[in-house]
Amino acid sequence: EVEKTACPSGKKAREIDESLIFYKKWELEACVDAALLATQMDRVNAIPFTYEQLDVLKHKLDELYPQGYPESVIQHLGYLFLKMSPEDIRKWNVTSLETLKALLEVNKGHEMSPQVATLIDRFVKGRGQLDKDTLDTLTAFYPGYLCSLSPEELSSVPPSSIWAVRPQDLDTCDPRQLDVLYPKARLAFQNMNGSEYFVKIQSFLGGAPTEDLKALSQQNVSMDLATFMKLRTDAVLPLTVAEVQKLLGPHVEGLKAEERHRPVRDWILRQRQDDLDTLGLGLQGGIPNGYLVLDLSMQEALS
C-alpha cells in the first residue's frame, strides 16, 4: 500500500507523459488523478514505467473501478496487463476482438500465462462459441491453442470455424480431440472436390473412422506415412492390404520402416501373410497361411 501524502507543489500531473517515470511511488499516488489515468491509458504503454510504478497505476485504477475495468480502459492496458491477476480479469467483460488482440499483443512471443488463459476463457464464454474470427486470432498468437481445449470445449466450435485451422494448429492434439474435430472438418469441407478435400481434411484424419478411410482409399489420395501413422489404430485395423495400398499409393513403401510401430505393427498382425507378401516389401508377422481368424469381439456380441 502507498501512503496518502499531499502532492508537492507544481508536481500535479496535467497529463500522462514521460515526466512521470521520474516520480517516486508516493508522488505518483499523490499527483496522478485516477480519472485522468483512465482517459489517457493509451499513453501508458509508450512510457517505460517501472513495474513498481505500474503497481501504483494499477492500484489507482482498482480504486476507480472496484467492480472491474470498463472495456475502454482494458483495450489500452498495454504493459499494465502484465500486472493483472486472473482474479482481476474475471471481473472484466471483454466483448471486442480488438481488445483481445491488443492484450494478446502484450504477451506475444511468450508462453500462455494463467492471465491470458483466463482472458481467453472470459472472451469465448462471453461470445458463446469459438467463432472463426476468434479462432483465427487465437491460433495466430498461440498455434497450440486448439489442442489445449478439452473435447467438451471443442464441441462448441462450429464447423464454419474449422476453415481457420492450419495444420500446425493440430500438432499437439490427441486422438480424443481429433475425434471431436474430425466430424466438424468433414462437414466444413464436404462441398470440395476429391484432391482439394483431401488437402484440407488431412490434418484431421487422426479422428477418422474406418469407413471414411476406406472411402478415401478409392480416391487416389496418396496419403503420406506421417499422416498414416497418426490414424486411429482401431480405424486402421479393419483395412485390407489392398485398401492400404490404394490409400498410400507410392508411399506404401514406407510401411517397411514403420513395421515395428503402431498402427502399422498392429495392422500387420491382422493381415494374412500371403496378402502382405503381395506388397513385395518384406513385411513379416502376418497370419500364416491355413490359419483361421476368429473375431472374438463378434462372438461375444452374439452370445
Epitope: 514521460e18 517505460p48 517501472t50 513495474y51 513498481e52 504493459y79 502484465l82 500486472k83 500465462s113 492471465q115
Partner: nanobody, 119 residues
C-alpha cells in the same frame, strides 16, 4: 535470471567526462527496459536515465544535454551512460537496472559503480 555488472566509475574533475558500462548476462532476450539510477550518500535512489525496449531515451532534468544513455542488443547486452560536463553534485553510486518481460515481471540490479566529481 539476469546478472548486471557495472564498470567505468572513478574520480574525475568538474567539467570532465566518464563513460559507465553495464554488462548484462543470463536471460537477456527477456529484458524490457534498462535504467541508470544513482544514490548519493544519505540520499534516496534517483532515476537518472532510461532507455526503453524500442530504444527511446529519457533523462532526469538536471542531466539532460550532459548525459547520454545507450544500449546495444547484441549477444551481450550492454548499457552505457556517457557523462559529460560533470558537476560535483553528480557524485554518487551509479546503479544499473533492467526489468524483464513476463508475469509478473522482475527487476534486476547491479552492485553499482562509484563516480566522484571533485577537484
Amino acid at each position: 535470471q539476469v546478472q548486471l555488472v557495472e564498470s567505468g566509475g572513478g574520480l574525475v574533475q568538474p567539467g570532465g567526462s566518464l563513460r559507465l558500462s553495464c554488462a548484462a548476462s543470463g536471460s537477456i532476450s527477456s529484458i524490457r527496459h534498462m535504467r541508470w539510477y544513482r544514490q548519493a550518500p544519505g540520499k534516496g535512489l534517483e532515476l537518472v536515465a532510461t532507455v526503453s525496449n524500442d530504444g527511446s531515451a529519457y533523462y532526469l532534468g538536471s542531466v539532460k544535454g550532459r548525459f547520454t544513455i545507450s544500449r546495444t542488443n547484441a549477444k551481450n547486452t550492454l548499457l552505457y551512460l556517457q557523462m559529460n560536463s560533470l558537476k560535483p553534485e553528480d557524485s554518487a553510486l551509479y546503479i544499473c537496472n533492467a526489468d524483464t518481460w513476463g508475469w509478473p515481471g522482475a527487476d534486476y540490479w547491479g552492485q553499482g559503480t562509484q563516480v566522484t566529481v571533485s577537484s
